[in-house]
Amino acid sequence: LSVQQGPNLLQVRQGSQATLVCQVDQATAWERLRVKWTKDGAILCQPYITNGSLSLGVCGPQGRLSWQAPSHLTLQLDPVSLNHSGAYVCWAAVEIPELEEAEGNITRLFVDPDDPTQNRNRIASFPG
């Protein structure tokens, strides 16, 4: 089982949309795949895929999950808020026929405030 996640870095404006993609590949067929998205180590959702369908379509605040055969799991955040900023990781495990798991690399999501003055103030507040 292998998991490739992208993009590595994503910068979007508050109120827009962010799309994180996880490609899950396995050399042999699987009957049930457990998937998980985490943000800063906390679980956003942990559905499974069987018969080509996700058991859950919601993933965290304003998060929508979709599965596109043969291998693409997409997390769409819409609309994006400032507290969506963080480090996202996709994890997958084949549960049936036999347990095998893998996880992607981190996607770092940066959300810029809709009001540019907020952005200037935030940057100005950094020490040094």
Epitope: S2, W30, E100, A102
Partner: antibody, heavy 120, light 113 residues
């Protein structure tokens, strides 16, 4: 590009252990998502998958041979090996190593094969 | 284990003519999770290792001539060579990767008539 080369004795006595090594060049056997297999071709041309070792060191064997087979690896030498115990004449075959990836699940690179004869 | 049954055992076809090889699996090789058939086709020329032609039942490997056509789904698969060339002679094998153990068909020997 990836190249695989089998090595080992061409003649093994019955009841002994067959030992072969596959040396991989141009690619690391620890690369995520890749599987390193042994396949044999019997004199009648029948192809038989023996088993694989994956990028993390996990193995999967053909149940018909599982009690006699061990596949291991040496990442420092970029090699993986086959041991088949208690051999009989039925184990006489051309033994090939081959690689396969999660993303493209087919044997895309093969060694040229080495003939192993089991005979006293 | 999934049993792969190939037919015919051997086949003689004239140059430029169509060659058809069949492969029947003992259980379905289609997954609704991935929308894929876990079936590959290989050609083995004398003195060489097998070389992949078709994967996922119908996808030609890059560089494989378009006269090689893979079709079928579930348990019934076909490899068609639309216009036989001299270099196409050899042994053809189907192979599944639906589950372990991976198994091959017994092969079809293709010759020129």
């Amino acid at each position: 590009q990836v190249q695989l080369q089998e090595s080992g004795p061409g003649l093994v006595k019955p009841s002994q252990t067959l030992s072969l090594t596959c040396t991989v060049s141009g690619f690391s056997i620890s690369t995520s998502g890749y599987y390193w297999s042994w396949i044999r071709q019997h004199p009648g041309k029948r192809l038989e998958w023996i088993g694989y070792i994956n990028y993390g060191g996990g193995t999967s064997y053909n149940p018909s041979l599982k009690s006699r087979v061990t596949i291991s690896r040496d990442t420092s030498k970029n090699q993986f090996s086959l041991k088949l115990s208690s051999v009989t004449a039925a184990d006489t075959a051309v033994y090939c190593c081959a690689t396969m990836a999660d993303r493209f699940a087919f044997f895309d690179v093969w060694g040229q094969g080495t003939m192993v004869t089991v005979s006293s | 284990d999934i049993v792969m049954t190939q037919s015919p055992d051997s086949l003689a076809v004239s140059l430029g003519e169509r060659a058809t090889i069949n492969c029947l699996s003992s259980q379905s090789l289609f997954s609704s999770n991935t929308n894929r058939n876990y079936l590959n086709w290989y050609l083995q020329k004398p003195g060489q290792s097998p070389k992949l032609l078709i994967y996922h039942a119908s996808t030609r490997l890059s560089g494989v001539p378009d006269r090689f056509i893979g079709s079928g789904s579930g348990t019934d698969f076909t490899l068609t060579i639309s216009s036989l060339q001299a270099e196409d002679v050899g042994d053809y094998y189907c192979q599944h990767h639906y589950e372990t153990p991976l198994t091959f068909g017994d092969g079809t020997k293709l010759e020129i008539k």
